[in-house]
């Protein structure tokens, strides 16, 4: 669909005459038919097969054509066509006088033509004016003319429909040879498709305007690159949606359980060494100087009994001080200046020479000790009792009293409250520190799992178009994680389809 | 009165040519055109081909091209229409008749005035 | 080329009575500009020239009886004579002035019965 223009631009009559060669009377009032056709080598009679357009008055005998083209579009005349333009024509311009203001043909006579003009050849679809002047015996008309395409109507032959738009069916305009050019941030063929935040995961992410990045279920961040991880999940992460892959030292469904207790809490004290011994429980093991569960508790340096041979202990701010008896010297009195002529051994304890007779050492008898056998034997010494078990001397024995939770001899067993498997349907058992928990397979609830809740969420094939479907163990629902192209809960809607157009 | 006025018979041998004229009179000639049509024996009508007296455009029947001319001469109001290389075939009467000429057909009225007719006789 | 079919080729009528006679064209000929049919009829007597009888397919020329009219649109035509009179016995013509080559009808002859 296009346009044929044509400006006319003066007519010349100068004798005031017509074709016949008769004057006219008073002047030739001329107004112009025009016929536009198919291309013929002889332009012969025949309907206008584009188009005919006529003019009113324009002026008498010899006159300049004003540019009308703003005040109503009479010059240049218009020559519509609805086709493709075939880039050849015919063009006949008419010059008629108008005796009177009746200028329809049937009111005029065929011998009213002052003169007429045919043109034929090429003419390519362009905005250039092609300028142009004819002249008969006694008339000399100038004009120009072009085709130009319609609104919306592009090519060299004007036959290729396009209009902008930017709308749910296209967002773009028209280029000169009629090809879409999609506004910024769409693409596809008919620039329906957004181009999603710069980005955005090609098949986690999604958009349904540009520079958006919607998340598809399972996916999350700003440029849906990051997994879900399951519903309760402390202290896990995912690879995959809804997945739970507990850190270090963290076990259970939800990563809820702590296998690093040392690590997470640091419970031992004034540089004690953490040992791990199960879910929540842990050994610290006490720097000299320290006791107590978590080597809270700072011993006197003394208490280790550390001086010989009767020697008295002072505690100093750096350490201890032992103060010999006669006869001892040295750090611990543990060196002496007596000999076994001395009778150094108490409490039945036998004398041996050694080193020539310039040193000895006593054998004690049982329940006591010392270099002299000056102490009775405490067994408790050694602190044997593990987790804050007290000790207990009994004659030549001793005893560990342990405290709540934990058995064996030096109370290093920690008491399981899971040992008699209290959790029914294959629940996970948990030791807490005054109890358990019990952690529910899908399908049952209670503090034991003991009650049947309801059956897998994914049983019923839930999702659509090949989606994978997730139990959300901690809500008995379920999740469709939708394949590239599909959105909605069940992954039902197909996502950017370009629609058929009706052209 | 409008009237065609056309030259006389003629009897011409077969490969000869033969020109008839046409003259036109009560009109503005140059503004119509003049189509010339022939009937053989016992036929009907032919279209032979047409001339713009305005300016001389003319348009043939395909089965004459090549062999017909037709020519107008404004000063004298007259219009020719030679045949050559004449054959037996070619025996009829041959009439001009007023035509509408090229441009827009709003005074088309077909062939409303038309000449008694010239019969050219082609025989060995 | 536009190919004009009449028929019949020939009819006898009786005096006073009513002939008709049909014209198609193998393609339209009506020019939807001036909503004009661009076809005409023709009389030929015998020894003369076809005489005009109407163009426009309907518009009769200025002289003509209006006993004779013409009738259609776009490809399908028809002259009557309405009540035939002796003087009417001749060869009808139905042609077509859309375009060039102008093309004829077969013609239709016209008797009294």
């Known amino acids: 669909s296009g346009v044929f223009q044509l400006q006319l631009q003066e007519f010349i009559n100068e004798r005031g005459v017509l074709a016949s060669g008769r004057p006219c009377e008073p002047g030739c009032r001329t107004f112009f038919r025009v016929c536009l056709k198919h291309f013929q080598a002889v332009v012969s009679p025949g309907p206008c097969t584009f188009g005919t357009v006529s003019t009113p008055v324009l002026g008498t005998n010899s006159f300049a054509v004003r540019d009308d083209s703003s005040g109503g579009g009479r010059n240049p005349l218009q020559l519509p066509f609805n086709f493709t333009w075939p880039g050849t024509f015919s063009l006949i311009i008419e010059a008629w006088h108008a005796p009177g203001d009746d200028l329809r043909p049937e009111a005029l006579p065929p011998d009213a033509l002052i003169s007429k003009i045919a043109i034929q050849g090429s003419l390519a679809v362009g905005q250039n004016w092609l300028l142009d002047e004819q002249t008969s015996t006694l008339t000399r008309l100038r004009y120009s003319y072009r085709v130009i395409c319609s609104d919306n109507y592009y090519g060299d032959n004007c036959s290729r429909l396009c209009k902008k738009r930017n709308d749910h069916f296209g967002h773009y305009v028209c280029q000169p040879d009629g090809n879409l050019s999609c506004l910024p941030g769409w693409t596809g063929e008919y620039c329906q498709q957004p181009i999603c935040l710069s980005g955005c995961h090609e098949q986690n992410g999604y958009c349904s305007k540009p520079a958006e990045c919607l998340c598809r279920p399972g996916w999350q961040g700003r440029l849906c690159n990051e997994c879900i991880p399951h519903n309760g999940c402390r202290h896990g992460t995912c690879s995959t949606p809804w997945q739970c892959t507990c850190d270090e030292g963290w076990g259970g469904l939800f990563c809820d359980q702590d296998l690093n207790y040392c690590t997470h809490h640091s419970p031992c004290k004034n540089g004690a060494t953490c040992s791990n011994s199960g879910q929540r429980s842990y050994t610290c093991t006490c720097r000299p100087g320290y006791t107590g569960v978590d080597c809270e508790l700072e011993l006197s340096e003394c208490d280790s009994n550390p001086c010989r041979n009767g020697g008295s202990c002072k505690d100093q701010e750096d350490g201890y001080h032992c103060l010999c008896p006669p006869g001892y010297y040295g750090l611990h009195c543990e060196h002496s200046t007596l000999s076994c002529a001395d009778s150094p051994c108490f409490n039945g304890g036998s004398c041996r020479e050694r080193n020539q007779g310039a040193n000895y050492a006593c054998e004690c008898p049982p329940n006591f000790t010392g270099s002299n056998c000056e102490k009775k034997v405490d067994r408790c010494t050694s602190n044997p009792c593990a987790n804050g078990g007290q000790c207990l001397n009994r004659g030549p024995s001793r005893m560990c009293r342990c405290r709540p939770g934990f058995t064996g001899t030096y109370c290093e067993l920690h008491v399981s409250d899971c040992a008699r498997n209290p959790c029914a349907h294959g629940g996970t058992c948990h030791d807490l520190e005054n109890g358990l928990m019990c952690t529910c397979p899908a399908g049952f609830s209670g503090r034991r799992c003991e009650v049947r809740t309801s059956i897998d969420a994914c049983a019923s094939s839930p999702c659509f178009n090949r989606a994978t479907c997730y139990t959300d163990l901690s809500t008995d629902t379920f999740v469709c994680n939708c394949p590239y192209g599909f959105v909605g809960s069940r992954c039902e809607f197909p996502v950017g389809l370009p629609p058929s157009f009706p052209w | 009165e409008v009237q065609l006025v056309q030259s006389g018979a003629e009897v011409k041998k077969p490969g000869a040519s033969v020109k008839v004229s046409c003259k036109a009179s009560g009109y503005t000639f140059n503004i119509y055109g003049i189509s010339w049509v022939r009937q053989a024996p016992g036929q009907g009508l032919e279209w032979m081909g047409w001339?713009?007296?305005?300016?001389?455009?003319?348009n043939y029947a395909q089965k004459l091209q090549g062999r017909v001319t037709m020519t107008t001469e404004t000063s004298t109001t007259t219009a020719y229409m030679e045949l050559r290389s004449l054959r037996s075939d070619d025996t009829a009467v041959y009439y001009c008749a007023r035509d509408s000429d090229w441009g827009t057909p709003y005074h088309y009225y077909g062939m409303d005035v038309w000449g008694q007719g010239t019969t050219v006789t082609v025989s060995s | 080329d536009i190919v004009m079919t009449q028929s019949p080729d020939s009819l006898a009528v009786s005096l006073g009575e009513r002939a008709t006679i049909n014209c198609k064209s193998s393609q339209n000929i009506l020019y939807t500009s001036n909503n004009k049919n661009y076809l005409a009829w023709y009389q030929q007597k015998p020894g003369q020239p076809p005489k005009l009888l109407i163009y426009w397919a309907f518009t009769r020329k200025s002289g003509v009886p209006d006993r004779f009219s013409g009738s259609g649109s776009g490809t399908d035509f028809t002259l009557t004579i309405s009540s035939l009179q002796a003087e009417d016995v001749a060869v009808y013509y139905c042609q077509q002035y859309y375009n060039t080559p102008r093309t004829f009808g077969q013609g239709t002859k016209v008797d009294i019965k």
């Open positions: 001339i713009s007296a305005y300016n001389g455009n003319t």
